[in-house]
């Protein structure tokens, strides 16, 4: 869609990532227009004939929707008048990745913007002390990743140390044959130290921290999506 007509309206999108099997959001905002019936939102995907989603006259019009999106798309209907054209995507599929266009037509004019949507799998790691091992070790597990991530260990006391020789990482394919469970074991750990297990692919980076002392074990996990914005 090229922009025709005298008036351009600003449409803003954000690159984002979808977690396979979960709900996703493709973000798009535009200059608000209080006349809901005059707003048309069209979502398109590069390489796909037909629409991803169309919302006009205050309701969905799915007559031209492409088969691969049937039953899985919705806009935030009550937020359209305030300029939110974001698309909800139910049960994100690996094949949903690609370039999308958010096209807006209101009584003020027309505009569009593209966004890159990445899909994969990412999950929080959990670190536990593995008391079964002959020497004290740490076990870092994360249930769902795709594409295959890299795993690295770090320690607060031995900053900059390379733990690849004293760790073992395995990837186990999950039942749906796409995502994988990540398990990494770090051997010969010492108490009164904080260890970090970092899992990263081109979509997300997750870190699990564990602090082991004589009296307690403290854990913290965080997950960040990469290249969004």
């Amino acid at each position: 869609f090229g922009i025709s007509g005298k008036h351009f309206i600003t449409v803003t999108t954000f690159t984002s990532a979808g977690n396979i099997g979960e709900d996703g959001t493709l973000s798009c905002t535009f200059e608000p227009d209080i006349k809901l019936n005059g707003i048309v939102i069209q979502w398109l995907k590069e390489g796909i004939k037909g629409l991803v989603h169309e919302f006009k006259e205050g309701k969905d019009d799915l007559s031209q929707q492409h088969e691969m999106f049937r039953g899985r798309t919705a806009v935030f209907a009550d937020q359209v008048v305030v300029g939110n054209a974001s698309l909800r995507l139910k049960n994100v599929q690996l094949t949903d990745a690609g370039t999308y266009t958010c096209y807006i037509h209101t009584s003020k004019g027309k505009g569009n913007a593209n966004l890159e949507y990445k899909t994969g799998a990412f999950s929080m790691p959990e670190i536990n002390v593995d008391y079964n091992a002959s020497s004290e070790s740490l076990r870092c597990e994360a249930p769902r990743w795709f594409p295959q991530p890299t795993v690295a260990w770090a320690s607060q006391v031995d900053q900059g140390a390379n733990f690849s020789e004293v760790s073992n990482t395995s990837f186990e394919l999950n039942s749906e044959n796409v995502t994988m469970k990540v398990v990494s074991v770090l051997y010969n750990v010492t108490i009164n130290n904080t260890y970090s297990c970092m899992i990263e692919n081109d979509i997300a980076k997750a870190t699990g921290d564990i602090k082991v002392t004589d009296s307690e074990v403290k854990r913290r996990s965080q997950l960040e999506l990469l290249n969004s914005g």
Partner: antibody
Framework: QVQLQQSGAELMKPGASVKMSCKAT????????IEWVKQRPGHGLEWIGE????????TYNAKFKVKATFTADTSSNTAYMQLSSLTSEDSAVYFC??????????????WGQGTSLTVSS | QAVVTQESALTTSPGDTVTLTCRSS?????????ANWVQEKPDHLFTGLIG???NRVPGVPARFSGSLIGDKAALTITGAQTEDEAMYFC?????????FGGGTKLE
Amino acid sequence: QVQLQQSGAELMKPGASVKMSCKATGYTFSSYWIEWVKQRPGHGLEWIGEILPGTSITTYNAKFKVKATFTADTSSNTAYMQLSSLTSEDSAVYFCARYYFGSSSFYFDYWGQGTSLTVSS
Amino acid sequence: QAVVTQESALTTSPGDTVTLTCRSSTGAVTTSNYANWVQEKPDHLFTGLIGGTNNRVPGVPARFSGSLIGDKAALTITGAQTEDEAMYFCALWYNNHWVFGGGTKLE
């Protein structure tokens, strides 16, 4: 009018498998999700999972991932749920329900009458 | 997995207004939980009432309404009728799965 007609009651032996059906009439079968729900006395309702007919897209409650398998046949407008390795814990009434996902709302509207499953040796 | 909690039973009289609530163990219920309300009458007769927090399922009487009250989802029956005596279940969506509440018996 919209109807979801479920198959009849089943009496099965432990370790066996059962496949129950949910036939949809009165609407475009492939435009709505079919949800499967388990009801046991004293346990309320438990969501098993969902399938979008005409696609291979399914979502399972982690608890039922090994137990249940969903399929759908768009030529007969029928959704199926197979339960494997049956135990007494699987004795329950199983419901299919239609779920609409759209911009104006997201709702379970029509439900089947339920299929009663008894697992006993 | 989250736990969804409802009042186990409520009593009302014809013509009264009654509110049933639905709480999530993970924190405040939001519009992203797509709160659904379902009615069960004897012999396993289920009917969807409300979806997406506050949208009535087509054909459901206007006396049924859904909302968020504080950190909970709520179903309000304004001017309850004798045929509203039933079990009411709420269901909340958690990004990739539904969790049902234990149900409220309305008498």
